[in-house]
């Protein structure tokens, strides 16, 4: 399945929107830095495209879920959030089309299921951190920075998959 060129542009727009969402000076937030343990190995180049797309889909779905909460709506600019949702929704659609195309071709590898679980656990850690920090502005900024980094890393994987073909 070939992801459309617009998918890459959408990924870049998503990162731009995340950058624009920033609301406070970040230097005072250093003490809230946290190791969320992004499962980078699950986005390694050893995977085939068919195995990677469901993992990328899970990643974007979890980002969507994280920023769709009541607490998130209170933390960020509504207009930017709406644009952000639109971009994520479009990327989910692109990836879902690929997942559907891949159904029935091969059995779902166990490796892929483990990777999806690792992504879910990563987002559980982020959610728990926000809860522990009482959804403070700094905690949200730390999470935004983390999502920018992890989303960027997963986007880079998409690009490397495309260039390999």
């Amino acid at each position: 399945c070939d992801l459309p060129q617009t998918h890459s542009l959408g990924s870049r727009r998503t990162l731009m929107l995340l950058a624009q969402m920033r609301r406070i000076s970040l230097f005072s937030c250093l003490k809230d830095r946290h190791d969320f343990g992004f499962p980078q190995e699950e986005f390694g180049n050893q995977f085939q495209k068919a195995e990677t797309i469901p993992v990328l889909h899970e990643m974007i779905q979890q980002i969507f879920n994280l920023f769709s909460t009541k607490d998130s709506s209170a933390a960020w600019d509504e207009t930017l959030l709406d644009k952000f949702y639109t971009e994520l929704y479009q990327q989910l659609n692109d990836l879902e089309a690929c997942v559907i195309q891949g159904v029935g071709v091969t059995e779902t590898p166990l490796m892929k299921e483990d990777s999806i679980l690792a992504v879910r656990k990563y987002f559980q850690r982020i959610t728990l951190y926000l809860k522990e920090k009482k959804y403070s502005p700094c905690a949200w900024e730390v999470v935004r920075a983390e999502i920018m980094r992890s989303f960027s890393l997963s986007t880079n994987l998409q690009e490397s998959l495309r260039s390999k073909e």
């Epitope: 937030c29 250093l30 003490k31 983390e146």
Partner: antibody
């Protein structure tokens, strides 16, 4: 390959102005902060301040607040450190280094080669 | 501001020795964001350890970091000729970021 390349050595007179630069390459310049560190001859490292090139937000050490200005031009991936009126006590080696911001990643993992500033009448 | 105090200020050691440098913060670094750097004369500092105990990529495993709260340690398990340098700790917990005064490791 990640690189921070600083401008060359400067010899200035007291009261003169100066702007030194630090050009980043091999990474997304706006995804990292740039910090500036002073090292006076035979002395230790002193943190001067930091800039987020994505929006030019800055933070300074109280010791350097009002003494220097940190700026950045993200269009050319360059950070700057400037003085409006140099003093003999500004004679030092100045380093820039990249910082991961709020990410849990190595602090100051790449450094520029340093710019030696000599202020003498 | 968080003050960082290193000890000793200098030490003499031989190749193969185990070397320990300590760094004490004036207040607790609650997320343990304490970094260690090595600097050789005429060169820029080089990151060795970040977040108290994480070894920076490409740094030999003879270097290790430990500690939490206010007390941190850099250990060189078996000193090599290229390890003679000045070592600095730095807290990344809050601005202003601050460095220790340095520990010079010299040849005995």
């Amino acid at each position: 390959e990640v690189q921070l390349v600083q401008s060359g050595a400067e010899v200035k007179k007291p009261g003169e102005s100066l702007k030194i630069s630090c050009k980043g390459s091999g990474y997304s310049f706006t995804s990292y902060w740039i910090g500036w560190v002073r090292q006076m001859p035979g002395k230790g490292l002193e943190w001067m301040g930091i800039i987020d090139p994505s929006d030019s937000d800055t933070a300074y050490s109280p010791s350097f607040q009002g003494q220097v200005t940190i700026s950045a031009d993200k269009s050319i991936s360059t950070a700057y450190l400037q003085w409006s009126s140099l003093k003999a006590s500004d004679t030092a080696m100045y380093y820039c280094a990249r910082h991961p911001g709020l990410n849990w990643a190595p602090d100051f993992d790449y450094w520029g080669q340093g710019t030696l500033v000599t202020v003498s009448s | 501001d968080i003050q960082m105090t290193q000890s000793p200020s200098s030490l003499s050691a031989s190749v193969g020795d185990r070397v320990t440098i300590t760094c004490r913060a004036s207040q607790s670094i609650r997320n343990n964001y304490l970094n260690w750097y090595q600097q050789k004369p005429g060169k820029a500092p080089k990151l060795l350890i970040y977040a108290a105990s994480s070894l920076q990529s490409g740094v030999p495993s003879r270097f290790s970091g430990s500690g939490s709260g206010t007390d941190f340690t850099l250990t060189i398990s078996s000193l090599q000729p290229e390890d003679f340098a000045t070592y600095y700790c730095q807290q990344g917990y809050d601005t202003p970021l601050t460095f220790g005064q340095g520990t010079k490791v010299e040849i005995k």
